[in-house]
């Protein structure tokens, strides 16, 4: 059993038919010494008296909130849960497995620049009695500082006949070093609590692995003349870290017709801009990636051709 | 030239290089996630592998002060990278072919450090901690770990050297 | 899109030679080597071994020296293998195929095959 | 040499059966290992290397473990155009060799 915080207490128990749970013994936060009983959630009945209440936590029956009482009067709260472990393994029912990059993925973070600013989220199907806490750090033996703000819900969709709910996290690196190389991956662990059941989840990358630029903006086309060519200009997102000089991104830019079927022009550039031929009724898109590490490309930017 | 006295080096010689190495360090290792490498537990193979930090002066600011902490560290970098390319860890098995990128990225190690300290000039280089692994399962790790984090390395190089070509060249 | 395509179907009497080629097109022939394998009818396949355009360095399988030779022709982007001294045995499916760019043997553009068939 | 067992030589399962072949190396090859699917009367076809990891394009049905001396390729819904040969691949060592090939039918 420990503290996760003030009062809350997670027990940690191995899951399998007829296990013999784990003893807890509760202390009621008193300097009474006498006439102290013991309560379950909202029930009145007395499950022992004296200042501590030993009990065999075995199921959820046995976890929830334990109050003890003096005549009437709430002197204090130890609220139990638990977290299942079955077959060596922590139980994962909370979260969804989203699957990307790999199985087991839970939780998904991405960086639009080297700021040491993140977002990360994750899903679920449950939509009630719910509670996240993040926590994050570079590195965890020598542990340096990142700052998460409050997880909040950020999206709802509907998948087939289940809800689904993604929540967001942002933190920021208290100390970021954007032209460093990072030797020590960021930590990221997020505590869910489900009614009585408790969950961890954890994440560990470094921000380059993370890195998805927004689109580039300003995406314009200027035709040339006399030709069916036309020039596509674009610029930097606004979120990219700076000096572009130093922190460099490449260009992918792709000219589509309307039909996915029809061949794709592809054209890799390190400039801002690019000579293309405009076919009728396609479009011309164009994406970003870190000039000199292989993460995530943006999201396309587009205009049609017309 | 980025000699112990101070001169500047070619930084747009040095600059297409490192854009090179970029390149050939990903063609040689282009999976990001088949393997979690920090999951594998045998951290101390890795954590010698000297790393541009932020000290470095390796910054904007830091190269427009004076570009030579940063270059010596990239230095270093360089030739402890080349060292371990041309070792055991990539000749023994798994067998790499001829065509391996690994082949192309030792070289291009080397030109580009001989490109920041010509012969006859000296700055200290970093100790190769000497890891010959038996078996061909920790070899292959090891060679995964080493190209991961030479992708990293080369990219700050790369970026120091691009930035170095916009704004330091004379 | 990278291409080998491989000559056509050989019948040849025991004690004869063969001589089986490989156009590759599609990327920089002197950039990769190319490898051959045979399958006989029914059978897994094996590895003959390969040859590295660029510096027209060949390594075969210890099991197939002195019986086979492989070569490359670069101003026509070409493999070639020659099979000498034929037996029945050498009857079998022979494959070209380029690896992936990583350096490591696993092949991703294979040869549409060539049929040898050794009978006398 | 080192010799790739694969096994079974021939197995017939049903549409939507989980499938499992396996392959032993003599000896330690990390996870030097592809698999290959080869239809009949056609190439073979990547869709396995470095044990696991699936090449482009290949379905999800398909997936490789294993390291060192153990691998196995496992279709996890067999299909019917999952018809066909296939085969292990050793590439950590001269010479490269392959396992003898599984038959894989339909019930």
């Known amino acids: 059993i420990w503290e996760l915080k003030k009062d809350v207490y997670v027990v940690e128990l191995d899951w399998y038919p007829d296990a013999p749970g784990e003893m807890v013994v509760l202390t009621c936060d008193t300097p009474e010494e006498d006439g102290i009983t013991w309560t379950l959630d909202q029930s009145s009945e007395v499950l022992g008296s004296g200042k501590t209440l030993t009990i065999q936590v075995k199921e959820f029956g046995d976890a929830g909130q334990y109050t003890c009482h003096k005549g009437g009067e709430v002197l204090s709260h130890s609220l139990l849960l638990l977290h299942k472990k079955e077959d060596g393994i922590w139980s994962t029912d909370i979260l969804k497995d989203q699957k990307e990059p790999k199985n087991k993925t839970f939780l998904r973070c991405e960086a639009k620049n080297y700021s040491g600013r993140f977002t990360c989220w994750w899903l679920t199907t449950i939509s009630t009695d719910l509670t996240f806490s993040v926590k994050s750090s570079r590195g965890s033996s020598d542990p340096q500082g990142v700052t998460c703000g409050a997880a909040t819900l950020s999206a709802e969709r509907v998948r087939g006949d289940n809800k689904e709910y993604e929540y967001s996290v942002e933190c920021q690196e208290d100390s970021a070093c954007p032209a460093a190389e990072e030797s020590l991956p960021i930590e990221v662990m997020v505590d869910a609590v489900h009614k009585l059941k408790y969950e961890n989840y954890t994440s560990s990358f470094f921000i380059r692995d993370i890195i998805k630029p927004d689109p580039p903006k300003n995406l314009q086309l200027k035709p040339l003349k006399n030709s069916r060519q036309v020039e596509v200009s674009w610029e930097y997102p606004d979120t990219w870290s700076t000096p572009h000089s130093y922190f460099s991104l490449t260009f992918c830019v792709q000219v589509q017709g309307k039909s996915k079927r029809e061949k794709k022009d592809r054209v890799f550039t390190d400039k801002t801009s690019a000579t293309v031929i405009c076919r009728k009724n396609a479009s011309i898109s164009v994406r970003a990636q870190d000039r000199y590490y292989s993460s995530s490309w943006s999201e396309w930017a587009s205009v049609p051709c017309s | 030239r980025a000699v112990p006295g101070g001169s500047s080096p070619a930084w747009t010689q040095c600059q297409q290089l490192s854009q090179k190495l970029c390149t050939l360090a990903w063609s040689a290792h282009p999976l990001v996630g088949h393997m979690d490498l920090r999951e594998e537990g045998d951290e101390e193979t890795t954590n010698d592998v000297p790393h541009i930090q932020c000290g470095d002066g390796c910054d904007p600011q830091g190269l427009r002060d004076n570009s030579q902490f940063c270059l010596q560290r990239i230095h270093q970098g360089l030739i402890f990278y080349e060292k371990l390319l041309g070792s055991d860890i990539f000749t023994g098995e798994p067998s790499l072919l001829p065509d391996s990128p690994v082949g192309q990225l030792h070289a291009s190690l080397l030109g580009l450090s001989q490109l920041l300290q010509p012969e006859g000039h000296h700055w200290e280089t970093q100790q190769i901690p000497s890891l010959s692994p038996s078996q061909p399962w920790q070899r292959l790790l090891l060679r995964f770990k080493i190209l991961r984090s030479l992708q990293a390395f080369v990219a700050v190089a790369a970026r120091v050297f691009a930035h170095g070509a916009a704004t330091l060249s004379p | 899109q990278v291409q080998l395509v491989q000559s056509g179907a050989e019948v040849k009497k025991p004690g004869s030679s063969v001589k089986v080629s490989c156009k590759a097109s599609g990327y920089t022939f002197t950039d990769q080597t190319i490898h051959w394998m045979r399958q006989a009818p029914g059978q897994g396949l094996e590895w003959i071994g390969y040859i590295y355009p660029r510096d027209d360095s060949p390594r075969y399988n210890e099991n197939f020296k002195g019986k086979v030779t492989i070569t490359a022709d670069k101003s026509t982007s070409t493999a070639y293998m020659e099979l000498s001294s034929l037996r029945s045995e050498d009857t079998a499916v022979y494959y070209c195929a380029i690896p992936d760019r990583s350096g490591y043997a696993w092949f991703i553009y294979w040869g549409q095959g060539t049929l040898v068939t050794v009978s006398s | 040499d080192i010799q790739m067992t694969q096994s079974p030589s021939s197995l017939s399962a049903s549409v939507g059966d989980r499938v499992t072949i396996t392959c032993k190396a003599s000896?330690?090859?990390?996870?030097?290992v592809a698999w290959y699917q080869q239809k009949p009367g056609k190439v073979p076809k990547l869709l396995i290397y470095?044990?696991?990891t699936r090449h482009t394009g290949v379905p999800s049905r398909f997936s490789g473990s294993g390291s060192r001396t153990d691998f196995t390729l496992t279709i996890s819904s067999l299909q019917p155009e999952d018809v066909a040969d296939y085969f292990c691949h050793q590439y950590s060592s001269y010479p490269f060799t392959f396992g003898s090939g599984t038959k894989l039918e339909i019930k």
């Open positions: 470095w044990a696991s």
């Open positions: 000896r330690d090859v990390a996870i030097a």
